[in-house]
Interface confidence: medium
C-alpha cells in the first residue's frame, strides 16, 4: 500500500495511492462486480428456495456455495475496495480482524464447497450403485456443516487471537492483514492448504470423472441399440434401494389398470412406498417409468434378444413379495446425481425367480423407453457433466492461481511483486464468487427459467418451473 505524504502537516498523511480518475474507475468496476456477485448468488438461493424442483441434494451444495459467495460479494469485496482506494485501513483493528476472519473463513468455505461438489460428482460416477443410497439430505447437511465448521476452526481463532498468543499486535492501525502472514513461509503454507491441495484434489477427481465418462461412452457406442436414444447413449444401472417387507400387493394383484402414458406411468401407492426414501429430483427432460413390474403380467414377460441386457442386483430377502422397478432416463444437469442415463432401481424381489424376472422386466422397459434415432444427437450427458466440472475447475484455477503463484514467488523474492499486482491477484480470488453462479446454475435449464421468472417478476407458477 503506497502511502504518499502530505508535507503541509507534521503527521504522516495516509492518502490514496491512486489518482481521482483511477479511484472512480476502481470503485465502478469493483462496485459492479460486487453487485453482480450479490444478484447472482441471491438468484441461486431464492431459486432453490422457491422452486421445489430445485430442492435436490446437489443444489443444497450450491445453496451453501451461494451463501459463501454472497458474503464475499457483500462484505469482502466492498471492504477491500475501500482499503485499496483509500490506501489505508480506516475502520480500526477490531473491524480489521473481523473482516479478515470473515474473508478467509468464507473464502475457504467456498473452496470446500467446490471440493464437496467435486467429490459428490466423483462418487456419482464411480459408485453409481452404492453412493446414491447414502446421498441423503441429512448427509448433504452434515457435509455442508463440516465445510463451514472446519473453515471456521482453521482460520477464525488464528486471525482473531494470534496477537494474544504472541503477546503483541504488530499490525498498525492504518494496516489490515493477518498478523502471522509476516512470515513468507507461513503464508506459503496456508496457500498450499487453501489452494494447491484443493486444486490437486479437484484435478485428480476431474481426471477420474472424465475417464469414467469416456469409458462409459465407449461402452455405449459398442451397443447398437443404445444409440437409438436421441438424448444420449443409454446406460442401464440396476440397484437395490430397500427391500420392502410390508404385505403389499404382489406384481399381479390387479394393478394392470395403470397404463403407461407417454413413457410415464402414473404413481400408485406401491410406487410411492418404494421410492419414499429417494431424493426429490427434478425430472427435467426425463423419461421415467415407475412400477412397471406391477403393471406387467407374468405372461407378458418374455425374453427379448433385441434389448439391452442388464445385470441387476437382487434382494437377499426371499420372502419379500414386492418387486418395484423404477427406470428413468434422467438429465443430470447440476441437480441430479447419476450421470448415467437410464437408471433401473429394483426394490425387493418376487420369490425365487426374482432375479430372472427382474432382468426380463428391465429389458422390456429399456426397449419401451427408447425413442426413434435422430440424425445428429446432442452431446451426451456424460460429456455435459464432465464439461461442467471442467468449467468449475478452470474457473477456480484461473481466479485463484495468480494470487497463489505470487505467494509462491514471494517466498523466494519479497519485493518482486508490485502492490497493484497483489491487489489484482487478491481481487481475482473474489471474482471466483462472481463466476460460481454462472458456472453451476446456468448449466441447468430449470435454474435458467427460474432466474428469468424472478428477474421478470413472474411469480405465478415459479414453484413448479421445470
Amino acid at each position: 500500500m503506497n502511502n504518499s505524504t502530505n508535507s503541509s502537516n507534521n503527521s504522516l498523511a495516509l492518502t490514496s495511492p491512486y489518482k481521482t480518475f483511477e479511484v472512480v474507475f476502481i470503485v465502478l468496476v469493483a462496485g459492479s462486480l460486487s453487485l453482480v456477485t450479490i444478484i447472482g448468488n441471491i438468484l441461486v438461493m431464492v431459486s432453490i428456495k422457491v422452486n421445489r424442483h430445485l430442492q435436490t441434494v446437489n443444489n443444497y451444495f450450491l445453496f451453501s456455495l451461494a451463501c459463501a459467495d454472497l458474503i464475499i460479494g457483500v462484505f469482502s469485496m466492498n471492504l477491500y475496495t475501500l482499503y485499496t482506494v483509500i490506501g489505508y485501513w480506516p475502520l480500526g483493528p477490531v473491524v480489521c480482524d473481523l473482516w479478515l476472519a470473515l474473508d478467509y473463513v468464507v473464502s475457504n468455505a467456498s473452496v470446500m464447497n467446490l471440493l464437496i461438489i467435486s467429490f459428490d460428482r466423483y462418487f456419482c460416477v464411480t459408485k453409481p450403485l452404492t453412493y446414491p443410497v447414502k446421498r441423503t439430505t441429512k448427509m448433504a447437511g452434515m457435509m455442508i456443516a463440516a465445510a463451514w465448521v472446519l473453515s471456521f476452526i482453521l482460520w477464525a481463532p488464528a486471525i482473531l487471537f494470534w496477537q494474544f498468543i504472541v503477546g503483541v499486535r504488530t499490525v498498525e492501525d492504518g494496516e489490515c492483514y493477518i498478523q502471522f502472514f509476516s512470515n513468507a513461509a507461513v503464508t506459503f503454507g496456508t496457500a498450499i492448504a487453501a489452494f494447491y491441495l484443493p486444486v490437486i484434489i479437484m484435478t485428480v477427481l476431474y481426471w477420474h470423472i472424465s475417464r469414467a465418462s469416456k469409458s462409459r461412452i465407449k461402452k455405449d457406442k459398442k451397443e447398437p441399440v443404445a444409440n437409438q436414444d436421441p438424448v444420449s447413449p443409454s446406460l442401464v444401472q440396476g440397484r437395490i434401494v430397500k427391500p420392502n417387507n410390508n404385505n403389499m400387493p404382489s406384481s399381479d394383484d390387479g394393478l394392470e389398470h395403470n397404463k403407461i402414458q407417454n413413457g410415464k406411468a402414473p404413481r400408485d401407492p406401491v410406487t410411492e412406498n418404494c421410492v419414499q426414501g429417494e431424493e426429490k429430483e427434478s425430472s427435467n427432460d426425463s423419461t421415467s417409468v415407475s412400477a412397471v413390474a406391477s403393471n406387467m403380467r407374468d405372461d407378458e414377460i418374455t425374453q427379448d434378444e433385441n434389448t439391452v441386457s442388464t445385470s441387476l442386483g437382487h434382494s437377499k430377502d426371499e420372502n419379500s413379495k414386492q418387486t418395484c422397478i423404477r427406470i428413468g432416463t434422467k438429465t443430470p444437469k447440476s441437480d441430479s446425481c447419476t450421470p448415467t442415463n437410464t437408471t433401473v432401481e429394483v426394490v425387493g424381489s418376487s420369490g425365487q425367480n426374482g432375479d430372472e424376472k427382474q432382468n426380463i422386466v428391465a429389458r422390456k422397459i429399456v426397449k419401451m423407453t427408447k425413442q426413434p434415432a435422430k440424425k445428429k444427437p446432442p452431446p451426451s450427458r456424460e460429456k455435459k457433466v464432465t464439461r461442467t466440472i471442467l468449467a468449475i475447475l478452470l474457473a477456480f484455477i484461473i481466479t485463484w492461481a495468480p494470487y497463489n503463484v505470487m505467494v509462491l514467488i514471494n517466498t523466494f523474492c519479497a519485493p518482486c511483486i508490485p502492490n497493484t499486482v497483489w491487489t489484482i491477484g487478491y481481487w481475482l480470488c473474489y471474482i471466483n464468487s462472481t463466476i460460481n453462479p454462472a458456472c453451476y446454475a446456468l448449466c441447468n435449464a430449470t435454474f435458467k427459467k427460474t432466474f428469468k421468472h424472478l428477474l421478470m417478476c413472474h411469480y405465478k407458477n415459479i414453484g413448479a418451473t421445470r
Epitope: 500500500m1 502511502n3 499490525v171 508490485p418
Partner: nanobody
Framework: QVQLQESGGGLVQAGGSLRLSCTAS????????MGWFRQGPGKEREFVAS????????QYADSVKGRFTISRDNAKSTVYLQMNNLKPEDTAVYYC??????????????WGQGTQVTVSS
C-alpha cells in the same frame, strides 16, 4: 496511525557533519526496513541510504558512499543518518522512509514530513 518524525537538520558548512534522526511511532519497529531519501531544489527525490529490519544489511547511493552511515536502534524505534564531509550538493530536504513488506499484501510504505539540510560553501 504510523508516524515518522525527522530531526537533526540545519545549516552546516562544507566539510562539516550532521546527524539526522527519525523516530517512528509504530508497534513493532523491527518489522520495518528504514531508509533516507532526499530532494534537492528543482530535483527529483533520490535514494540516499537504507537499512534492513535487523540492521545487518545496509545500502548507500554512490554519491554518499564512505561519507554517510545509516544505523538503527530498535529499542528506541529510531533510525539515524550520520553525515560526514558534507558538500554543497548535499543540500536538500531529507525524508525518512519506513517500509514493511507483508506477504500476500505487498508493501506498506510510510514517509516522514522531511527535515531541511543546507550545506554552505
Amino acid at each position: 496511525q504510523v508516524q515518522l518524525q525527522e530531526s537533526g537538520g540545519g545549516l552546516v558548512q562544507a566539510g562539516g557533519s550532521l546527524r539526522l534522526s527519525c523516530t517512528a511511532s509504530v508497534r513493532t519497529f523491527s518489522n520495518y526496513g528504514m531508509g533516507w531519501f532526499r530532494q534537492g531544489p528543482g530535483k527529483e527525490r533520490e535514494f540516499v541510504a537504507s537499512i534492513s529490519w535487523s540492521g545487518t544489511m545496509t545500502q548507500y547511493a554512490d554519491s554518499v558512499k564512505g561519507r554517510f552511515t545509516i544505523s538503527r536502534d530498535n529499542a528506541k524505534s529510531t533510525v539515524y543518518l550520520q553525515m560526514n564531509n558534507l558538500k554543497p550538493e548535499d543540500t536538500a530536504v531529507y525524508y525518512c522512509n519506513a517500509v514493511k513488506y507483508i506477504p500476500g499484501r505487498g508493501e506498506y510504505d510510510y514517509w516522514g514530513q522531511g527535515t531541511q539540510v543546507t550545506v554552505s560553501s
